[in-house]
């Protein structure tokens, strides 16, 4: 007897973070075999989609034309074979920003940090949120994400990053959100540019990237530089 | 920073396969897209496909029949396979990486692009 | 499949001219739109994406703008290096189409 059919892929494009109103597709890929796909969304009633595999069968494409709340949250797909149906796909987080106010970001105790010192970058919401994440330009995923402990509401987050070095530099914005949906994001906050010079005790100028990139794949965060936060948030990886 | 270095024959007879590689270096090819594109003698640009890290992969529908881009994360390559080439299929290939995510809820273009490698079929 | 048409296929403007070269989608596309410029026998170069935001290094005096399916590339002050060919291309969604090219000449 053959063994289960193999779980197809889901991705997204042109990926997986949206701005409200913006159009996202997502798409499924299984095999060859395949005679229908089906969309599921956590929370949601089964399946939440179907389509008819596009030629040559082997994906299906699930269009959302214009992004908002409702679309924003896990997803996996599944694809009918003759034989029956293929195990689920890994998931597909799907989140939507714009959801609240922009928060605002800063540096301290400047954004002109020297290679070898500490700054902090500081995240503030104009209302008590709970989860705060920092973005680096050009990064694929979050850099780093802050969730309070307890639930606790709070107006700010701080990232601290010590010892700085060059590849810190670069441009920054921080998102804020509620823990009862972390796939709703606020506006992004107005960019921060992190600029690092050269150690005192080395005059030579720091190598700057002009792009930086991410290490790991688009659907897993990066992981943190720096130490643990002086605020009551703590970091958490999703 | 990343770069794109390409890689394959530039003379292909007709009814054979064309065979292109792109290495990524100063950076992990595990995020963002990896496509391909080409460029026949005096024409515009046209997409042919790309591939994520995990080998998902979308291609130009005319094109989708003789078409196969595949990744190898090891190595830090992708990979276009053009088969049953034509004189139609003369052109300079070009490999590229679309921008991943931009904090701004935007995503990039293609902002890193291979040199193009100049590809003749012709027996 | 979307299909893009880029507007005018060539156009002659002289140095310091403000010129305006425009890209429409047969269907929405949000601003998931890149324009790129390629010089002769060079490489292609990403000018502009997300429809408005210019990519690092590149002149201000390119911009863009749009969304939906209308969307609109503009050299302020024509400088001789903009002697090139530009191209509007879709990244929404597979396929990532381009525009057919619009040459620019130096009168």
């Known amino acids: 007897q053959a063994g289960p059919l193999p779980k197809p892929t889901l991705w997204a494009e042109p990926g997986s973070v949206i701005s409200w109103g913006n159009s996202v597709t997502i798409w499924c890929q299984g095999t060859l075999e395949a005679r229908e796909y089906r969309l599921d969304k956590e929370e949601s009633p089964a399946p939440w989609d179907r389509q008819n595999p596009l030629e040559p069968k082997n994906k299906a494409r699930f269009s959302i034309p214009s992004m908002t709340e409702d679309y924003a949250g896990r997803y996996r797909c599944y694809y009918r074979s003759p034989v029956g149906w293929s195990q689920p796909s890994d998931p597909l987080e799907l989140v939507m920003t714009g959801a609240y106010s922009k928060p605002t970001l800063s540096a301290l105790p400047s954004p002109l940090v020297t290679s070898g010192k500490s700054v902090t970058l500081l995240c503030q919401s104009r209302s008590p949120m709970d989860t705060f994440l920092l973005i680096k330009e050009r990064a694929a995923h979050p850099l780093l994400h802050l969730r309070s402990e307890h639930g606790a509401q709070q107006h700010q987050a701080e990232f601290p990053m010590s010892p700085v070095t060059s590849v810190h530099g670069g441009t920054y914005r921080c998102f804020s959100s509620h823990g009862f949906s972390h796939y709703l994001l606020s506006h992004p906050s107005d960019p921060l540019e992190l600029i690092v010079s050269g150690s005192l005790e080395d005059p030579r100028p720091s190598p700057t990237r002009s792009v930086s990139t991410a290490a790991g794949p688009e659907d897993q965060p990066l992981m943190p530089t720096g130490s643990v936060p002086h605020s009551g948030l703590r970091r958490h990886w999703e | 920073q990343v770069e794109l270095q390409q890689s394959g024959p530039g003379l292909v007879k007709p009814s054979e396969t064309l065979s292109l590689t792109c290495t990524v270096s100063g950076g992990s090819i595990s995020t963002y897209f990896w496509s391909w594109t080409r460029q026949p003698p005096g024409k515009g640009l046209e997409w042919i496909g790309y591939?994520?890290?995990?080998?998902?992969?979308n291609y130009n529908p005319s094109l989708e029949s003789r078409v196969t881009i595949s990744v190898d994360t090891s190595k830090n390559q992708f990979s276009l396979k053009l088969s049953s080439v034509t004189a139609a299929d003369t052109a300079v290939y070009y490999c590229?990486?679309?921008?991943?995510?931009?904090?701004?809820?935007?995503?990039?273009?293609?902002?890193?692009w291979g040199q193009g490698t100049t590809v003749t079929v012709s027996s | 499949d979307i299909q893009m048409t880029q507007s005018p296929s060539s156009l002659s403007a002289s140095v310091g001219d403000r010129v305006t070269i425009t890209c429409r989608a047969s269907q929405g596309i949000s601003n998931y739109l890149a324009w790129y410029q390629q010089k002769p026998g060079k490489v292609p170069k990403l000018l502009i994406y997300a429809a408005s935001t210019l990519q690092s290094g590149v002149p201000s005096r390119f911009s863009g703008s749009g969304s939906g399916t209308d969307f609109t590339l503009t050299i302020s002050s024509l400088q001789p290096e903009d002697l090139a060919t530009y191209y509007c291309q879709k990244y929404d969604s597979a396929p990532w189409t381009f525009g057919q090219g619009t040459k620019l000449e130096i009168k």
């Open positions: 590229a990486r679309r921008g991943g995510y931009y904090g701004s809820g935007n995503y990039g273009g293609m902002d890193v």
């Open positions: 591939t994520n890290y995990r080998g998902n992969t």
